[in-house]
């Protein structure tokens, strides 16, 4: 090999040994029989030298240094070339660098042709190899603007003061051109200005100076975002930190097209604007940080760009003014992530800050909208709170468990409606009366309806899960001690059409000791099925529920358990059932942990099944699952 | 375990020639390159040479250029120095050493040594 | 050919000092500069490599440091088992070469 650097070409080249490999073997650069380890080429010298060994590439990189000053003299702007041509370098991955230094009042500005950079974080490489490491300065100071790869949105940067600009090649690369061209410009008064320009839809991520470092301190820097007027720009900020300052505030500040209110201030903890119509800019300003403990501001956001979506001109009003004790939150429903681009799903408050997911609370009237390409990746989940604190006041008190006609009109399927209902410890318990009688989920009988009523405690400490219930059944009431939630859960979106169906009223009722009463009116033709809370987990320690199991005087009741031993083992005290006529208070009781459970029995008036548990040994639990059938009492049951 | 174990102590008379050998265990010197470093009583070290075994091509330090030969048997995985036409300033300690290009571009193994003593 | 000077040629120190042994090249090496411990009737170890890197198992007192043609190694607190003889070599260029080396006793 021979390079030749011309006199005052300002370029140094340098040979030097590179990322060690699992090679053992040295390879060296041999200069007239010498073996040396690196070599530098200055300008005005003329080296020949080869290596020792077969693949230099897997030992050796050259780097190529060009300083140019545009301090002294005129500046060499336009196309940047790559000098020496890498037609006539070894084949070894080459970084070339320009050192430009210039005065604090003049701008430089990179230009970078199609195709434009794409910024890339700290761990990530570049899929071709290529990369462009940027940088600048403040008096003496380096600031690393970032590192970019080919096929992103950025076209321009404008710095002062100087730039380092660094493109690797790697060994086996074509590439012959550098790629950009310099352009002086006036004083930027700021750190650097990033241009970004979106053809189309997609999106770009973007750091501050020196990131994942702290940027600069008391620095501005701005991103120009070039979006086409049809298309809609939003931002969210991906990760952020925050110095302390002694002085100012860290802030963004936004121009955006139509905005009353330029620069629209923010700060880093804020919700950022989203649907954005056209170009606009975003400012990072820091702060005098404190001397002792400066901290550090940093930022990665992402600009998302896409088609606006026809709900995004449609403003929803959700009135939330008479409701307390609220909220309700519209998320992205759970996905599997793809690796394609998928356009941004957002919801937006009075259409301008968007998020992926949005809050609304309870006394005020909230306007929203969307900006996203399909809507079912999106749901809404409720929660209110009912609760009394007075007994005396609350007593047989009613409240309608339904869900606001507002909430079922946006275009968002509800996927949870979350009422919370509190009573006061040991004075009050509720009842639960619905619309329509309800239908305990099983494996043997599975809801098929597009909602379900959860029914669970809600005392923090206790694991008791009444069951799934659906309308269209045989109960015809639930009686619970405390405090429970219930949770309207939605399965398909035909609820739209049957939430006509639902109604569920709680009334606060004089307190009693069972954990929960089941009120069962079955209807002839069809076979009740009815299980255990906490079904799979078994029933709580020292639970006790019951089922008031109503015979019509034309008929007669099967009652049937479907396993032959309870299966509980008891650690301490007795689990047992009670079943009890209710006319005649005659009563059977089983011990669940010793007998085998009852066969098939009929009844030929209402009553009673109550099932109450010990402290069972773990893994021996307490699940049972019983039906009951009615049949015309005028057939012989002999 | 890498180990290089170096032949024995040799007296030998001004004008002799003398072969040292160095066999290597726990590698293959096809892999790495082999140096020889001479030190002589009571002075510092003085680098003699290298060998790539797997080609036998060898670089010395011009002052043991026909000095010192550098060979290499990779069958047996042994590398030898011979040394020609000795007198008193030979006498010294020699070693060998495994070169590691790969992180170090440095002597990571070494021999016990062998003396060479030169005497009439 | 690249001379290496190694000073002092002798050191004597007590155990918990801090000792500093310097190698000069007479031309820019670039860091290929290697530390070499040999202690009384053993053949060299590998101390450090690339001027500053410890090679596995070399404990945290030594350190390398240096650039252009000055380099430094350090013993931040003398051990007893650290008399030897310390070499600089340099690997930038053939022929290899050493520093004169530098004896450290213990008083």
């Known amino acids: 090999f021979e390079i030749a650097l011309p006199r005052e070409s300002n370029i140094t080249v340098l040979i030097k040994l590179g990322t060690p490999t699992l090679l053992a073997k040295p390879c060296y650069i041999v200069i007239s029989k010498r073996h040396i380890t690196m070599l530098s080429i200055k300008s005005g010298e003329r080296i020949v030298f080869t290596f020792s060994c077969q693949s230099p590439e897997n030992h050796f990189v050259i780097e190529i240094q060009k300083n140019i000053d545009c301090m002294s003299g005129p500046c060499p702007f336009g196309e940047v070339q790559l000098q020496p041509s890498t037609s006539l370098l070894p084949t070894l991955n080459r970084t070339f660098i320009w050192d430009v230094k210039a005065h604090k009042s003049i701008g430089l500005e990179l230009q970078f042709s199609i195709p434009r950079l794409r910024q890339i974080g700290p761990g990530e490489s570049c899929p071709d190899g290529v990369t462009h490491s940027i940088s600048g300065r403040i008096d003496a100071t380096v600031v690393r603007i970032g590192t970019f790869c080919s096929n992103g949105t950025v076209s321009r940067i404008k710095m002062q003061e100087g730039v380092k600009m660094a493109l690797h090649l790697p060994w086996f690369h074509p590439r012959n051109v550098s790629g950009f061209s310099i352009a002086n410009r006036s004083s930027i008064k700021r750190l650097c200005i990033i241009e970004s320009v979106f053809e189309g839809e997609g999106s770009a991520t973007l750091m501050s100076a020196n990131y994942p470092e702290g940027f600069p301190e008391d620095e501005l820097m701005t991103w120009q975002f070039v979006v086409p007027a049809h298309l809609r720009a939003s931002v969210s900020f991906l990760n952020f930190n925050l110095s302390n300052c002694e002085r100012k505030e860290e802030r963004v500040e936004y121009y955006i097209p139509g905005s009353t209110t330029n620069p629209e201030v923010f700060k880093l903890e804020d919700k950022q604007p989203g649907n954005m119509a056209g170009n606009f800019n975003l400012s990072l300003q820091g702060c005098d940080q404190d001397a002792q403990s400066p901290g550090i501001l940093r930022l990665q956001f992402q600009v998302l760009v896409q088609h606006p979506q026809n709900e995004s001109n449609k403003i929803y009003v959700v009135d939330l003014s008479n409701e307390r004790a609220m909220s309700l939150t519209i998320e992205p429903r759970p996905v599997k992530q793809s690796r394609k681009f998928v356009p941004g799903c957002f919801v937006c408050l009075e259409s301008r800050t968007c998020s992926s997911n949005l809050t609304l609370t309870s006394g005020s009237k909230h306007k929203i909208s969307f900006l996203c390409d399909d809507l079912t990746r999106l749901w809404m989940n409720v929660e209110k709170t009912i609760s009394c604190t007075d007994h005396r006041y609350c007593q047989r008190k009613s409240y309608s468990l339904q869900v606001p006609s507002d909430i079922l009109h946006l275009p968002v399927e509800l996927h949870d409606f979350s009422w919370k209902l509190l009573v006061p410890k040991d004075r009050l318990s509720l009842v639960l009366v619905p619309a329509q009688k309800l239908q305990q989920h099983t494996h043997e009988k599975p809801c098929n309806t597009s909602f379900s009523y959860l029914v669970a405690s809600a005392i923090p400490s206790q694991d008791l899960y009444f069951g799934s219930f659906c309308p269209g059944g045989s109960i015809k009431q639930i009686q619970v001690k405390q405090n429970i939630s219930v949770t309207l859960r939605t399965f398909a979106p035909s609820f739209q059409q049957e939430a006509s169906r639902q109604g569920l009223t709680v009334s606060f009722i004089p307190y009693f000791k069972e954990e929960g009463v089941f009120t069962v009116t079955p209807d002839t033709k069809s076979k009740v099925y009815l299980r255990t809370p906490n079904w799979d987990r078994g029933l709580p320690s020292l639970t006790s529920v019951s089922w008031n199991i109503s015979v019509p005087r034309d008929q007669v009741a099967c009652l049937t358990f479907f396993k032959e031993r309870s299966g509980v083992v008891c650690q301490t005290g007795r689990a047992f059932m009670i079943i009890q006529e209710q006319r005649t208070r005659a009563e059977e009781i089983f011990s669940l942990d010793e007998d085998v459970l009852p066969k098939p029995s009929f009844h030929h008036h209402s009553f009673w099944v109550n099932i109450s548990n010990c402290s069972p040994t773990s893994g021996k639990q307490l699940d049972l699952l019983f039906s009951v059938t009615l049949t015309p009492r005028t057939v012989d049951l002999t | 375990e890498v180990t290089l174990k170096e032949s024995g102590a040799e007296l030998v008379r001004p004008g002799a020639l003398v072969k040292l050998s160095c066999k290597a265990s726990?590698?293959?010197?096809?892999?790495?390159?082999m140096h020889w470093v001479k030190q002589r009583p009571e002075q510092g070290l003085e680098w003699i040479g290298w060998?790539?075994?797997?080609?036998?091509?060898?670089i010395y330090d011009p002052k043991f250029q026909g000095k010192a030969s550098i060979t290499a048997d990779t069958s047996s995985n042994t590398a030898y120095l011979q040394l020609s036409s000795l007198t008193s300033e030979d006498t010294a300690v020699y070693y060998c050493?495994?070169?590691?290009?790969?992180?170090?571009?440095?002597?990571?193994?070494w021999g016990q040594g062998t003396t060479v003593t030169v005497s009439s | 050919d690249i001379v290496m000077t190694q000073s002092p040629k002798f050191m004597s120190t007590s155990v918990g000092d801090r000792v500093s042994i310097t190698c000069k090249a007479s031309?820019?090496?670039?860091?290929?500069v290697t530390w070499y411990q040999q202690k009384p009737g053993q053949s060299p170890k590998l101390l450090i490599y690339?001027?500053?890197t410890r090679h596995t198992g070399v404990p945290d007192r030594f350190t390398g440091s240096g650039s252009g043609t000055d380099y430094t190694l350090t013993i931040s607190s003398v051990q007893a088992e650290d008399l030897a003889l310390y070499y600089c070599?340099?690997?930038?260029?053939?022929?290899?070469?050493f520093g004169g080396g530098t004896k450290l006793e213990i008083k």
């Open positions: 050493a495994r070169f590691y290009g790969s992180y170090y571009y440095a002597m990571d193994y």
């Open positions: 726990g590698f293959n010197i096809k892999d790495y390159y």
């Open positions: 060998i790539d075994p797997e080609n036998d091509n060898t």
């Open positions: 031309q820019d090496v670039s860091t290929a």
């Open positions: 690339w001027a500053s």
């Open positions: 070599q340099q690997h930038y260029s053939t022929p290899y070469t």
